[in-house]
Structures are given as C-alpha cells and as structure tokens.
C-alpha cells in the first residue's frame, strides 16, 4: 500500500479545488438528495489520501467502475504528479482495471461512494486553522 506522507499536499489541494471538485459535483448533479451517511473518515492528510485512493480506485461489488470517471482520471494524474513514486505502484492496478466492463448507469451505491469522496476531500483540504492565521497575520 502506498504511503502518502511525502506528497505535496498544497499542490494536491490546488488541483482538487481547480478541477477534481468540479468533476465530483458534476457526477453528483441531478440527484434528488445527497444526504448519505458519512461512514468513511480520516484523521490526517496522508490518511485522507489513502481513503480517497481506496474509494476512487478499488472496485466494490455494487460500484465497480468509478476509476473510469473523469474525476478519477484527474485524481490519478494529480497523485502521480505530486506523490513521489505513486505512479509505479499503480501499474498493476491499471492493467487489472482495463479488463472490467464500462459502467452503464450511475447506481445509487456509486452516488453514495462519491458523496463519501466529497467528504474525504473536504477533510483533506481543511486548512489548519492556527497555521492559516499565522500566515494571515504574517502577510497583512
């Protein structure tokens, strides 16, 4: 399992805000309600990326192919770019993914999974309050 400790979190955060977040919301758009229970959490940034990686790329019985979605492709590119050695760990996973059938419909289970992803990303980009305040005072 990849260790996300040495990733450039600020660069990943910027990529998320710029593109990935919009693709996640596009995926969720049109749903009547997004009030799924949050069952997945994370306690620090590396842990958040571990959970995001798992939910985005590991197929589950009722939601097999999120990895083909635009947000997943961008997530993969972002992690490959800003996490040293990440792309090497994904070669086997990518080869296995190519054998799977393409998703035909967005199932409620997939919507729930993407809702969980939005929650994990929100935790990941949560700025440390004290450090932000120090930065704010320093520059003003």
């Amino acid at each position: 399992m990849y260790d996300f400790t040495n990733c450039d979190f600020q660069k990943i955060e910027a990529d998320y805000l710029r593109t990935i977040s919009k693709d996640l919301i596009t995926y969720m758009s049109g749903t009547k309600s997004t009030d799924f229970n949050n069952t997945v959490s994370c306690s620090n940034r590396p842990h958040c990326l571990t959970e995001i990686q798992s939910l985005t790329f590991n197929p589950t019985p009722r939601c097999a192919s999120l990895a083909k979605e635009m947000f997943a492709r961008k997530t993969k590119a972002t992690l490959a770019l800003w996490c040293p050695g990440y792309s090497e760990t994904q070669i086997n996973a990518t080869q296995a993914m190519k054998k799977r059938r393409k998703r035909k419909v967005t199932t409620n289970k997939c919507l729930e999974q993407v809702s969980q992803l939005l929650g994990l990303w929100r935790r990941f980009i949560r700025t440390l309050l004290k450090k932000q305040l120090e930065h704010h005072h320093h520059h003003h």
Partner: antibody, heavy 121, light 111 residues
Amino acid sequence: QVTLKESGPGILQPSQTLSLTCSFSGFSLSTYGMGIGWIRLPSGKGLEWLASIWWDDNRYFNAALKSRLTISKDASKNQVFLKIASVDTADTATYYCARIEDGYYSYHSYWGQGTLVTVSA
Amino acid sequence: DIVLTQSPASLAVSLGQRATISCKASQSVDFDGDSYMNWFQQKPGQPPKLLIYAASNLVSGIPARFSGSGSGTDFTLNIHPVEEEDAATYYCQQIDEDPYTFGGGTKLEIE
C-alpha cells in the same frame, strides 16, 4: 458585511409542517467551503444542531430528527430552506441559521437573530 | 453523530473567582494536529457568540479572561476572573464531523 435573517410562521399546529427560510447576504453559497446550518434553542433547553447544507449540495442532519427534516437551497437568491414535518409542542423553539465554513474562515461566526416558532393546539 | 457531554450543567461562581467548564466528546475531534472544538456564550434573547475556536484560540474582541484548552476528546473552558457580565449559558461545539453538534450547555451564575 455578512448578515443572516430567519423567517417562519410564528405559530402552527401539531402535525403541520414547519417551513423556515434563511435569507443571507455578504457571501455566496456557491463559493467553495461555504455552508448554512440550522440550529434551534427550545425554551429551557440547550442548543440543538438540526441540519446543514454545503456549497456542493451535501446535506447533513441530526440523526434523531433526520426522518422529519428537509433542507434545500437557492444559491442564486441567497436563501436556504428548512422543513420539519409532523411538528409537536416539543418543536417550540427559537430557530437560528448560521454561516458555516471549512478551512480559512472557520474561526468566524455569523448567526441570524433567530425566529420564534410556537407549536400550539 | 459525535456526542458532547458538558459538565457541570450549572455553576455558581463568586465575582473574581475562576469558572471551569468541561466538555467530553464521544470520539476525537482532532485532525492533523488541530482540535475542531468551539466554545460559545449565549445570553437570553441573543444568538450564540463565539468565544474560542480550535479549542484554544481566542476570537478577536473577546476578553483575555476567557481561555480554552484540551485536545482529542477532553476540553475545558476557563473564565478567570469572572465578571458579572459573564452570567450566561456556555456551549461547546464540535465542527470536526457533519453534522456539527453542541454540548448540553452550562449555565453560569455569578454570586
């Protein structure tokens, strides 16, 4: 300048649906990280968090009340709506809406003045 | 939902003395080294007023006699020296996980 204002029916009868509106200005609910929360203070009791809705349309509810609550937004009109179904006298309270934020602005706190709702037969 | 248990439910403190209010969370409200715990003061007929954010940070304009401490699941609000205007109900609030939740409140009376 950030302002929030709650509006509601004032008085309603048991079993009716309570509809509340939070009208706000000074920020946009389309901005990343922004959200609105609904909170109530029943007479003689403590603050109770009811529900929240975020810029990305994610919604969260107090587990004990979830089956009765509906929250929605009209970001273009700067309004958030809360509905509570099948009200009882226990729902008599002052209802507040508040701006909630992730990240940088989390240390700010903006609340409306509250609107009193009385459930009475 | 994260449950916050506040104690005591009510507290009577002499003018100039120390008031200590405790808040225990059912699970950790820490993330990446910061505690997502707030403290509010509420007086009758008014909305709650934020005193402390991130467990120990004093909001601008709040007197220095208010202080917060703690991490993980155990948090404390201290008021010292207590003044007459501090008579109010105090609430802890966690903003670590949706839905946010409040403690049951502590009513502070000044003797």
